[in-house]
Interface confidence: low
């Protein structure tokens, strides 16, 4: 008896070692052979294993060896009776064959996967428990060549098998075996197979449905987004005034003689700022009052107006080209050019005003939107003004009153208020007072530029040729055109960009006025200071204030033109009387009070010598409540004056802490000096009356704390009244004070109200539609309607 292949042994490294050998001839292993084994420890017991036949000549012997360890070495002896056939040693730790994994099962899992699970053949205490890796064989029962082998090298005895990797409808079998890498073991025997049917449907079958569902979902999302945007647009965006949709007509407050489009102040270089862009950047912020707010502020310090403190950013009419969407088309409606007689040192004033209003620094573009209320007031004033002048016929001359229309001075320009360049947009009030910018950025003020003017008016203003988007007032004397018939492609001409004298980096005028004033921040301030402060300033030709005086008279009495003094057209007062003629009847305008236009007195004292009719009437009457914010004279005080010695801090970028002073300077306009008065006198006097969005007459609250004049809070229109603490200190906010010091309460009971959008002929103004109310912190009811009073008072507002 001989051993053909000596025994090879493997241990499961837990309890059993198996040795297998082959004899040289068929042998009855259990009857003829014995395998003895013992640990080679001294004194260890000798054990005997009885082999079994695996094949005819192959014998296998399983030796129960407990707790094999690396140090264990077994001495093996193969005996055939008393004959030692083979002797050798065996170290179980060096010949490991792991146990066969058990309990292989297959479970359907989520997401069309099969979960194969089996059990680790070793208890957790055994060193091999955490050493095993597995091999899983998955084969198609009907296709021997269709099989896959997966190596599971992680700890868990599981395998997730995507059903899509198997043929649908086929029967598959899986089996698993283990291997202990750290022991350089052999693979265990294969576990018994487990069979299952792969009933997975390929994803291609679901593709059409999935694509359809995806398309529907995407479509639903798109539709919801579309309708949401439409709803937002209707509810919010469409409520924002748009030059392309607004019937507003820009009123040009300008010099009466010289075209400022091409004019440069001495020592000033033109800014690289085309007129259309300048005007857009000053105008369009006014149209985005609601919702756009302070979306983009200028990153650099822009030029502040002289009265502008570090309060809030003044954004209108500051350039905001970064923020505004340019209108698709510029269809210009007729522009009213209302000018006054020339004044003395117009050139210096023009320089200073032009510097600030014509071409704001591009660096300051994108100014913050904070002046919406003032702008709305200004635009609505213009709206009402034009409605009353032209009704709905599109002309500026009321029917039957062509002779009293205001003709444009020959040299007037449409550039003084750059917003006039664009259609259906009104001027914006420059920021001031509590609404002053809190940072210097975006603080350019669109103050009116003063320029010499002439009362000759057969010649249309040069702006017509300079910018075809403009139509001078004179061009409409003999025609009545519909709004918007002007040229829609304005010529792009560079404006002289002139900086405030107080800004070091800006060019300084070589010949500043002798009494350099802190310049008012806006045309409203300028007009207010000129008209209210200087009652007796003589001026060549028509009195500087005559235009406004006539306007007021017209407002108060609505009578035919009076020849009481030189003025525009046939009469100095004709234009405004024509306006007045459209107002409710009953008001009379007996003439100008003594010492006014006839005497060349440039100041307008609306509430001095008030009589039951209007100025000049013998008996006092109730103070007119429709004052445009300019009809009353605030009590002045010397310390509030704008004298020549005014601090230069009012001329440039205002340092922090000067906001109070800035406001004070506006509270005593009577103290202004002559240069300013002369300069201001050439401007048309009007202020914002109504909210631009709702057509309601605008009334203001004021919480002026430091000014000398006490301003009485009064209701404001519902659509644009906001926090009274944030209202601008502009001419509209000037105190309505009676000559005797009695404060004028600019509010009426609702009983006297009629819609402000209705002219005497009953024609509805395009601005009478109500708009959604802004957030209000003041106590007034936001639903009040703006009205024109039918009472004999000149005008009343609520």
């Amino acid at each position: 008896v001989k051993v053909l292949h000596e025994p090879s042994c493997f241990s499961d490294y837990i309890s059993t070692s198996v040795c297998q050998w082959k004899m040289d001839h068929p042998t009855n292993c259990s009857a003829e052979l014995r395998l003895s084994y013992q640990l080679d420890f001294m004194g260890s017991e000798n054990h005997t294993c009885v082999p079994e036949n695996r094949e005819d000549s192959v014998c296998v012997c399983s030796m129960p060896i407990d707790d094999a360890v690396e140090a264990d070495v077994y001495q093996l002896d193969l005996w055939a009776g008393q004959q030692l056939l083979w002797s050798g040693s065996f170290q179980p730790s060096k010949h490991v064959k792991p146990r066969t994994p058990g309990n292989l099962t297959v479970h359907p899992n989520i997401s069309h996967t099969w979960l194969l699970m089996w059990t680790n053949p070793y208890p957790t205490e055994n060193h091999l428990h955490s050493e095993l890796t597995y091999m899983v064989n998955v084969s198609n029962d009907n296709d021997p060549e269709d099989f896959k082998v997966y190596n599971v090298t992680y700890m868990g005895p599981t395998l997730r098998l995507a059903a899509s990797t198997l043929k649908s409808g086929a029967s598959y079998s899986a089996r698993v075996r283990a291997w202990a890498q750290t022991y350089n073991s052999t693979w265990s025997d294969w576990s018994p197979s487990t069979t299952w049917l792969n009933y997975y449907e390929p994803w291609e079958q679901h593709l059409p449905l999935g694509v359809s569902i995806s398309c529907l979902v995407i479509l639903a999302i798109c539709l919801s987004c579309y309708f949401s945007i439409i709803k937002i647009k209707k509810g919010w965006w469409d409520q924002i005034p748009n030059p392309a949709h607004s019937p507003l007509v820009a009123i040009v407050i300008q010099d009466s003689q010289v075209s400022l489009w091409g004019k440069r102040s001495r020592g000033q270089e033109p800014a690289k700022c085309p007129h259309w862009k300048t005007c857009l950047t000053k105008l369009l912020p006014c149209l985005l009052e609601h919702g756009l707010g302070r979306e983009e502020e200028s990153p650099k310090t822009a030029k502040n107006g002289p009265l502008q403190g570090p309060g809030k950013p003044a954004w209108c009419p500051v350039e905001v080209s970064k923020t505004i969407l340019w209108p698709e088309s510029i269809s210009v409606v007729q522009c009213v050019e209302l000018s006054e007689a020339p004044v003395d040192n117009e050139e210096e004033e023009e320089v200073e005003e032009d510097k600030r209003s014509l071409c704001p620094s591009l660096e300051g573009s994108g100014g913050s939107f904070q002046e919406g209320r003032e702008g709305i007031v200004a635009r609505l004033t213009e709206s009402l003004f034009l409605d009353l002048l032209g009704g709905e016929n599109g002309g500026f001359c009321p029917q039957g009153l062509e002779e009293s229309c205001l003709p444009p001075p020959s040299g007037s320009v449409g550039a003084q208020m750059p917003w006039a360049q664009f259609p259906r947009a009104g001027p914006r009030a420059a920021p001031e007072g509590p609404e002053q910018p809190r940072r210097p950025e975006s603080a350019l003020q669109a103050s009116p530029t003063q320029s010499a003017g002439s009362s000759a008016f057969p010649e249309p203003p040069p702006v017509v040729t300079d910018n075809p988007a403009y139509r001078s007032f004179g061009s409409f004397l003999g025609q009545s055109s519909d709004p918007g018939d002007g040229d829609s492609d304005p010529e792009l001409a560079d404006r002289p960009g002139e900086a405030d004298p107080g800004i070091p980096s800006a060019p300084q005028p070589p010949e500043p006025p002798a009494a350099l004033q802190p310049e008012p921040e806006s045309w409203e301030q300028i007009l207010r200071q000129s008209v209210l402060q200087h009652r007796a300033a003589p001026a060549p030709g028509p009195g500087p204030g005559s235009g406004y005086r006539e306007f007021t008279c017209a407002v108060k009495q609505g009578s035919a033109p009076d020849a009481g003094g030189p003025g525009f057209g046939p009469s100095g007062e004709a234009g405004y009387k024509a306006f007045c003629s459209l107002l409710p009847g009953g008001a009379t305008c007996p003439g100008t009070s003594g010492g006014e236009a006839g005497s060349g007195e440039g100041g307008y004292k609306p509430f001095q010598s008030l009589t039951p009719g209007c100025p000049g009437a013998p008996t006092p009457v109730p103070v007119p409540l429709f004052t445009f914010g300019l009809d009353t004279e605030p009590p002045g005080s010397p310390q509030d004056s704008l004298g020549a010695g005014s601090s230069p801090e009012h001329l440039g970028v205002e340092p922090a802490g000067k906001e109070e002073d800035s406001r004070k300077t506006l509270l005593a306009p009577e103290q202004a000096t002559d240069p300013l008065r002369d300069d201001l006198a050439s401007s048309i006097v009007y202020s914002a009356l109504t909210c631009h969005l709702c057509g309601h007459l605008k009334q203001w609250h004021d919480q002026e704390e430091r000014g000398k004049a006490h301003i009485v809070p009064s209701p404001c229109c519902g659509c644009c009244c906001g926090d009274r603490s944030s209202l601008l200190l502009s001419p509209l906010r000037a105190p309505n004070v009676l000559p005797g010091g009695v404060l004028l309460e600019a509010s009426l009971s609702p009983a006297s109200l009629v819609p402000s959008g209705v002219s005497k002929e009953g024609k509805s103004s395009p601005f009478s539609q109500p708009a959604s109310s802004s957030a209000q912190s003041s106590s007034q009811t936001p639903k009040k309607l703006a009205v024109l009073s039918t009472e004999p008072t000149c005008m009343s507002a609520s």
């Epitope: 129960p64 707790d67 360890v69 140090a71 208890p123």
Partner: antibody
Framework: QIQLIQSGPELKKPGETVKISCKAS????????MSWVKQAPGKGLKWMGW????????TYADDFKGRFAFSLETSASTAYLQINNLKNEDTASYFC????????????WGQGTLVTVSA | DIVMTQSHKFMSTSVGDRVSITCKAS??????VAWYQQKPGQSPKLLIY???YRYTGVPDRFTGSGSGTDFTFTITSVQTEDLAVYYC?????????FGGGTKLEIK
């Protein structure tokens, strides 16, 4: 968890026989061998021998051959130590201890059974 | 039989101290040495096997070292709960034998 629970204390007279049981739980009983350890009062540990729970083959230390016998009841996962012909020096605590897989160390121990032999 | 000798029957130490217990085999036992802890009234507990391997759940302040005939068991930072008797045992050959034990006392 793995536990080895031994039978209670025994009070015997010399010449009698005592059979101590050790019931295993928490693991596969036949996987690990079981040793028995004697600890006389105030003395150290003395290994008596072990039994293969897989094959049932016992191994005895020289000092514990003859009167001592290890046995199994695999179905009950229980190992037994039987001491015949008790002597006074047999008074001690007897522990069953399950082998560990890493070595011949004794990983789990029963709480011990005190056998008192007294005339 | 292989005799395992623990030279110190008693050792006194303080909490936080480092203490080492030695065990000497009468012959080379390679690394087949285990260490046990037996607290009063309790069963022994395996701490170290194969001379230097910590058993499952044993704190790492317990360490073992040595091979051949000299072995050392160390507690790097003694705690009060470490008061016990410590035994070494060889499992190189049967009969397995224990050392006499070293009783650790806390000052």
């Amino acid at each position: 968890q793995i536990q080895l629970i031994q039978s209670g204390p025994e009070l015997k007279k010399p010449g009698e026989t005592v059979k101590i049981s050790c019931k295993a739980s928490g693991y596969t009983f036949t996987t690990f061998g079981m040793s028995w350890v004697k600890q006389a009062p105030g003395k150290g540990l003395k290994w008596m021998g072990w039994i293969s729970t897989y094959s049932g083959v016992p191994t005895y230390a020289d000092d514990f051959k003859g009167r001592f016998a290890f046995s199994l009841e695999t179905s009950a996962s229980t190992a037994y130590l039987q001491i015949n012909n008790l002597k006074n020096e047999d008074t001690a605590s007897y522990f069953c201890a399950r082998h560990t897989f890493q070595s011949r160390g004794l990983a789990y121990w029963g709480q011990g059974t005190l056998v008192t032999v007294s005339a | 039989d292989i005799v395992m000798t623990q030279s110190h029957k008693f050792m006194s130490t303080s909490v936080g101290d480092r203490v080492s217990i030695t065990c000497k085999a009468s012959q080379d036992v390679i690394t087949t040495v285990a260490w046990y802890q037996q607290k009063p009234g309790q069963s022994p507990k395996l701490l170290i096997y194969s001379a230097s391997y910590r058993y499952t759940g044993v704190p790492d302040r317990f360490t073992g070292s040595g091979s051949g005939t000299d072995f050392t068991f160390t507690i790097t930072s003694v705690q009060t709960e470490d008061l016990a008797v410590y035994y070494c045992q060889q499992h190189y050959s049967t009969p397995w034998t224990f050392g006499g034990g070293t009783k650790l006392e806390i000052k």
